[in-house]
Interface confidence: medium
């Protein structure tokens, strides 16, 4: 089955520059298959805007500025590039790669989507490091004897620009854990979220991380934030040498004793 | 030109009460077009639901029913038992066909509709609060109530900045909140909870340890390092007495 | 405008292989709006679809579960035409035999029928 | 498989008669009919598809109505050239399945 992958969840440009949005296909040969670029303005129905076909053949769809965007592939990468030249203000919008997946039955073919990459016009000088800064908090001592449950939460301060995904993972797991999280709120010129995971008691001796993709994060990669397993007993802190945990980092977490 | 036209800009759902979204085709016959619903969560993922002719995306068959009506130019999706991970925008699409019939594989959207969960009606439950702490940080955790009515208060003479609270539903079907702030005096800082005309403490929810429980860290234990050291933690540290972690980047 | 035409054998000896060819003009069996299937008819069983073959960037066939071990349906895009061949025949398979287009803007139904083939498996 | 049951299986009619034929699917099939007229000798015709929608060039007293798994072909006034057997299909699942046919005879 096809799957698209857009790493950049946000692409932020100041005005008349180029931007130049990224689609990774896997499961399917690229050069197989046809990937469409659409886009969604605030307020607006989503558009499709160009494709490139199996054979390199472009679509534009009509109306659409010629110059304005230009598509490409690129079989090695198995990757799509949608590049906006000379960006402004009505350029902002989300912009959607996606391809169409043939079931297994006659006439049976479904679109699937890429997650999207929002285009932000920005004229603001921002300081140099508007990457999400986090905070972490452990379960209280009164809802883990309680409730038998411990809720963790990952707070997130002075990023730009807005858009910021979260979510939550065991240590040596791959599985996405069902988490909760309240709205990104402004702050002066950057913004704030955090995210909750409540787990039972039994899951509280295990690690776990809040990984938060971010278009300023540090070497573009996924920013992990370690959350220590949590004993009934004792627990060992055995943090590794560097402080941030960008790809292979770890963070450095001092505890903090306090008698709650 | 052909427009999908949907029903209601926003379509409020109970969890587990069917509900039914319908886009209507302005301009041209719904029985020339292939009808498509995806559905956008939080975080603007795109997800496929359903294609006419029984077609379901993964894990969306067994709560999802798609079709059209030919006669009323609609599409319709319903959502026989919604939960609150169905809460999101619902867009109805079309496939087109050129002209003398030919198939082209664009699609045509039309504007989404917001579906907004909310709990099934149910006997009020009075929330569990509990305070975290890190730094100057404090955040209020307010579980498992209902109704969704709630002022919370942190308590404090100190108060650096406040945020408005997040109130979501909870895998149970009722309702959790979490409001943040930050304050000089952030030890000191307990949480109230105005719900269902009652009041409820942080306080009511401390577990009582006798004082002998209550070991002091060792200095180095609590000292905060500086920002770009890193150092291991010279102890083994008593979890039940740790509820803070400060962090250093 | 479209039509189909068949060819092939009215005679086939049992556990032999059926084969019948259809031909298409005025569309394209690469077509992305179109389904080419094979249906036969007899005083037994009815109408029967057996399968079909279509185009979306790639090419997919669907069969009845009743012949899925013996039948295969072949576009072939340089006569455009397409194929069927059931393998090891018996007299149950005696009908007359139709190639049909599927089309995609009437949700599939078979707007356009070859002449029809009358089969008979005898020895 | 979806089965379709056509009812009934034979009808005497006369000319300027109003006929209803009806087609039963064994499981939903939402909208997805097709209504097939075969005349002795010759292959199939295509009536009605999306169990409602006129085939282009078929006379207007042909009509379909239905959904989920009851349907109906009306014929609004009999005309001679209308006596042929009439087959129902459903396209909504694989394999697509045909009634066993209802045979329209002159009374």
């Known amino acids: 089955a096809g799957h698209l992958e857009q790493p950049q969840i946000s692409s932020t440009k100041t005005l008349s520059k180029t931007a130049r949005l990224e689609c990774v296909v896997s499961g399917i040969t690229i050069s197989a298959t046809s990937v469409y670029w659409y886009r969604e303005r605030p307020g607006e129905v989503i558009q499709f805007l160009v494709s490139i076909s199996y054979d390199g053949t472009v679509r534009k769809e009509s109306g659409i500025p010629s110059g304005k965007f230009e598509v490409d592939r690129i079989p090695e990468t198995s990757t799509s590039t949608l590049t906006i030249h000379n960006v402004e203000k009505q350029d902002i919008a989300t912009y959607y790669c996606a391809l169409w997946e043939a079931q297994q039955e006659l006439g049976k073919k479904i679109k699937v989507f890429g997650p999207g990459t929002k285009l932000i016009i920005t004229d603001k000088q921002l300081d140099a490091d508007v990457s999400p800064k986090p905070t972490i908090f452990l379960p209280s001592i009164a809802e883990t004897k309680l409730q038998k449950a411990g809720t963790y939460l990952c707070l997130l301060e002075k990023f730009f620009p807005d858009v910021i995904k979260i979510h939550w993972q065991e240590k040596k797991s791959n599985t996405i854990l069902g988490s909760q999280e309240g709205n990104t709120m402004k702050t002066n010129d950057t913004y704030m979220k955090f995210s909750w995971l409540t787990v039972p008691e039994k899951s509280l001796d295990k690690e776990h991380r809040c990984i938060v993709r971010h278009e300023n994060n540090k070497n573009g990669v996924d920013q992990e934030i370690i959350f220590p397993p949590i004993k009934t007993d004792v627990i060992t802190m055995d943090p590794k040498d560097n402080c941030s945990k960008d790809a292979n980092d770890t963070l450095l977490l001092q505890l903090t004793n306090t008698s709650a | 030109a052909i427009e999908l036209v949907p029903e209601h800009q926003t379509v409020p759902v109970s969890i587990g009460v069917p509900a039914t979204l319908r886009c209507s085709m302005k301009g041209e016959a719904i029985g020339n077009y292939y009808i498509n619903w995806y559905r956008k969560t939080q975080g603007n993922t795109m997800t496929f639901i359903y294609r006419e002719k029984d077609i379901y995306g993964p894990g969306f068959k067994d709560n999802f029913q798609g079709d059209i009506d030919i006669a009323k130019n609609l599409a319709v999706l319903k959502i026989l038992a919604p939960s609150e991970r169905d809460e999101g925008s619902y867009y109805c699409a079309c496939d087109t066909l050129g002209m003398g019939g030919e198939y082209t594989d664009k699609l045509i959207f039309g504007k989404g509709t917001r579906v907004t969960v909310e709990p099934r009606s149910q006997p009020h439950t009075k929330p569990s609060v509990f305070v975290m702490k890190n730094g100057t940080n404090v955040a209020c955790l307010v579980k498992e109530f209902y109704p969704k009515d709630i002022r919370i208060n942190l308590v404090s003479s100190k108060k650096i900045t406040e945020f408005d609270p997040a109130i979501v539903i909870s895998p149970s079907g009722k309702y959790n909140a979490v409001k943040l702030g930050k304050y000089e005096d952030s030890n000191s800082v307990t949480c109230s909870v105005q719900h269902d005309n009652k009041t409820v403490h942080s306080t009511d929810f401390e577990v009582k340890t006798d004082s002998t429980d209550h070991v002091k860290p060792k200095e180095t234990e609590n000292t905060k390092q500086p920002s770009k050291s890193c150092h291991k933690p010279k102890a083994i540290v008593h979890t039940e007495k740790v509820n803070m972690m400060s962090l250093t980047v | 405008q479209v039509q189909l035409q068949q060819s092939g054998p009215g005679l086939v000896k049992p556990s032999q292989t059926l084969s019948l060819t259809c031909a298409i003009s005025?569309?394209?069996?690469?077509?992305?709006?179109?389904?080419w299937n094979w249906i036969r008819q007899s005083p037994s069983r009815g109408l029967e679809w057996l399968g079909g073959?279509?185009?979306?960037?790639?090419?997919?066939?669907n069969y009845a579960v009743s012949v899925k071990s013996r039948i295969t349906i072949n576009p072939d895009t340089s006569t455009n035409q397409f194929s069927l061949q059931l393998n090891s025949v018996t007299p149950a398979d005696t009908a007359v035999y139709y190639c049909?287009?599927?089309?995609?803007?009437?949700?599939?139904?078979?707007?356009?029928w070859g002449q029809g083939t009358m089969v008979t498996v005898s020895s | 498989d979806i089965q379709m049951t056509q009812s009934p299986s034979f009808l005497s009619a006369s000319v300027g008669d109003r006929v209803i034929i009806t087609c039963r699917a064994s499981?939903?099939?939402?909208?997805?009919l097709a209504w097939y007229q075969q005349k002795p000798g010759k292959v199939p015709k295509l009536l009605i598809y999306?169990?409602?929608t006129l085939q282009s060039g078929v006379p207007s007293r042909f009509s379909g109505s239905g959904s989920g798994t009851e349907f109906t072909l009306t014929i609004s006034s009999l005309q001679p050239e209308d006596f042929a057997t009439y087959y129902c299909?459903?396209?909504?699942?694989?394999?697509?399945?045909f009634g066993q046919g209802t045979k329209l005879e002159i009374k």
């Open positions: 049909a287009r599927g089309e995609w803007g009437l949700r599939d139904a078979f707007d356009i």
């Open positions: 005025g569309d394209s069996v690469s077509s992305n709006s179109a389904a």
């Open positions: 073959t279509y185009y979306r960037s790639k090419w997919f066939n």
């Open positions: 499981q939903g099939i939402h909208s997805y």
């Open positions: 999306v169990a409602s």
């Open positions: 299909q459903q396209l909504n699942s694989y394999p697509w399945t």
